[in-house]
Amino acid sequence: QDPWAAEPRAACGPSSCYALFPRRRTFLEAWRACRELGGDLATPRTPEEAQRVDSLVGAGPASRLLWIGLQRQARQCQLQRPLRGFTWTTGDQDTAFTNWAQPASGGPCPAQRCVALEASGEHRWLEGSCTLAVDGYLCQFGFEGACPALQDEAGQAGPAVYTTPFHLVSTEFEWLPFGSVAAVQCQAGRGASLLCVKQPEGGVGWSRAGPLCLGTGCSPDNGGCEHECVEEVDGHVSCRCTEGFRLAADGRSCEDPCAQAPCEQQCEPGGPQGYSCHCRLGFRPAEDDPHRCVDTDECQIAGVCQQMCVNYVGGFECYCSEGHELEADGISCSPAGAMGAQASQDLGDELLDDGEDEEDEDEAWKAFNGGWTEMPGILWMEPTQPPDFALAYRPSFPEDREPQIPYPEPTWPPPLSAPRVPYHSSVLSVTRPVVVSATHPTLPSAHQPPVIPATHPALSRDHQIPVIAANYPDLPSAYQPGILSVSHSAQPPAHQPPMISTKYPELFPAHQSPMFPDTRVAGTQTTTHLPGIPPNHAPLVTTLGAQLPPQAPDALVLRTQATQLPIIPTAQPSLTTTSRSPVSPAHQISVPAATQPAALPTLLPSQSPTNQTSPISPTHPHSKAPQIPREDGPSPKLALWLPSPAPTAAPTALGEAGLAEHSQRDDRWL
């Protein structure tokens, strides 16, 4: 059998690892697999990173292909750009390296495409169908630090065997990510187990210094110690346990606190109790009991539905407002009667969608041209008086479903993985936080919470995306965004969905970056962040009344009042990119520094009668979708009467919205 296809392998540097998984997967499946291990599909943005990928992949067969983290939505060609309109699965287009197999051709690129790397030769980048199951995929894992591989000792029975936090076992590493375990076997029959841990003086290092296979007082049987044997001054020996274990009552053996820990899902040694519990992707710790895990509300993920979303355990449903119908993908909404030729290429359309769409949206964009921000970082807003924003729902849903505007929320790291900051290569001048948006967000990596930004590379108008600020603990009030208060009026028990409130989770001690807000039940009071408002428009913040027309039993009615939110601009440095294409000279682009006030969309109706878009999701032909691969599927429909808001160019509130169409999607997003 082919050695290339045998087992996963990895190559690690001091701050990241690339791992090759020779498993046949579609792009979506590969993306999921990397995320489940705490990483992302590989994003080789610099020649140095590409060199590490090259050495990892080696000289494979010409017929083999490996997914990397580049995808492009239909009709998003930008052939003059180094990435040609492709976006990294981390949500940006920053690169100082490309390796396209062919020069850009001027085709219309009608369908969505993903990029695979050739396993042979120059490891060129090829584009193709995202639904093809290619031969394997490359993951990338970022971490806070790494330990160098252990030096072989004279008394060793063989090379150290390393196990990484992403479950790769090998003897071939040069660097070991924080959280890795090294197992050393000695000729004398005993061995040692070491953990790559944080050092008191800073940085990371092995939990025990060498030599590991020498010593007399502890010979011949390691002094009877299961882990470490220490020779005291008076000649007697005492036993110690490696990090993450504690000495048992017999004083010799070591026990894993996680073996008895009552964690429902994942346990990590350490912490005041000797262990700490974590939840798998898609779950979060229960408020009342951190040992238990509760289902993540998918509707909190920005962009999971184009218009409205209802969560339930294990899945969610998308809905469209009156005058719009749900498209076949179960996510996007288009004006009623326009299903054949999608009238809006909106958020759902831009999620991994293989569909074609000939509609032009330039008019809709021009009508809203002032409302986007070039800030790729988090937008900080001055605190303002929170306006009243009362919601009244009367949905006919099962009791465990919650109609909500989608927002992101944190997930927790897997066992032995360090709390992470977003991985960025040397092309970026600072670590940059993820942008969160109610319309076109960039999702954070599952284990990479955002950090506070400094300066950011400028993005062109093509890549502007709306931004919502997340609220962060322990920051001066000047940097806290305004909060819009949302409250629900009481409903009969049979129809009342659980109420939600946005709250900011406690950070893990010592080294946790701020997380996104999660939403939790808190009586009937809901606090939620809404999109900011363009400075030149007074937003119409909506208040929901309890009175509903008899024709619309499941309707959502909004009343309006105005509030203004000030915004702070951010400066942005430049970025240079290079290309390693065998057929064209190096791309050299220089993006000038820019300082712009951030401007955000408010709730919008359709921008033009012929090209209607979501009332709450203004669209731009080149604005970036959330980087969530997804598969399409048929969707049941629910028709409901509600009046539509009249088209207008100025931002106004959504007058009335109903759950006009919905799609049940069980675990269809990631």
Partner: antibody, heavy 124, light 108 residues
């Protein structure tokens, strides 16, 4: 130029076996997967399975599992397909086809070159 | 298994005509669709790959479009040598290829 040349026609009795060959030339044999496809009289094309000359990896259509075996002679750049326990409904033209890897910067798994076909007639 | 259904089964047209053949998949196959031309007694020839990309050497009058479940092969101006049987093929669940039943294009 790339060519796939298949062996001549075969007439077999029900229950017998047939083994046909597909000789490749004009490219590096181990770089491309070889698929086998058959077409009964007036029928649509039917995929039978593939063999990867790089590592001898094979995958067969469930319909033919247990009856079909695909092998290689790398030194002769030749792929073989054997079908056992023949029945009258196995009467068909059998094609070998090369799976493309990439065209003009695109990766794709369509079949870019085909052999001329081997007619197998199963009759008592 | 993914089924492919072509329509029509038979098509009569004249030289110079514009003809369209459609192929519908029983589930989403993205753009992993190819079109082949087969003449009597000959092996199929690749025309279009990845739903819309013309294979090297294929005349520009042949074009493909579609994604998801609905695909189209269009011949903009029929030439005498175009009368043949056309097959669509999906390979999204590679290596499990499936083919349509074929569309026979005849001279009117």
């Amino acid at each position: 130029q790339v060519q796939l040349v298949q062996s001549g026609p075969e007439v077999k009795k029900p229950g017998a076996s047939v083994k046909m060959s597909c000789k490749a030339s004009g490219y590096t044999f181990t770089d491309y997967v070889i698929h086998w496809v058959r077409q009964g009289p007036g029928q649509r094309l039917e995929w039978m399975g593939y063999i990867n000359p790089y590592d001898d990896d094979t995958t067969y259509n469930q319909k033919f599992k247990g009856r079909v075996t695909m092998t290689l002679d790398k030194s002769a750049s030749t792929a073989y397909m054997q079908l056992n326990s023949l029945r009258s409904e196995d009467t068909a033209v059998y094609y070998c086809a090369r799976r493309g890897n990439s065209y003009d910067g695109y990766f794709d798994y369509s079949m870019d070159y085909w052999g001329q076909g081997t007619l197998v007639t199963v009759s008592s | 298994d993914i089924q492919l259904t072509q329509s029509p089964n038979f098509l009569s047209a004249s030289v110079g005509d514009r003809v369209t053949i459609t192929c519908r998949a029983s589930q989403n196959v993205g753009t992993a669709v190819a079109w082949y031309q087969q003449k009597p007694g000959k092996a199929p020839k690749l025309l279009i790959y990845s739903a819309s990309n013309r294979y090297t050497g294929v005349p520009s009058r042949f074009s493909g479009s579609g994604s998801g479940t609905d695909f189209t092969l269009t011949i903009s101006s029929l030439q005498p040598e175009d009368f043949a049987t056309y097959y669509c093929q999906q390979y999204t669940n590679y290596p499990m290829y499936t083919f349509g039943q074929g569309t026979k294009l005849e001279i009117k």
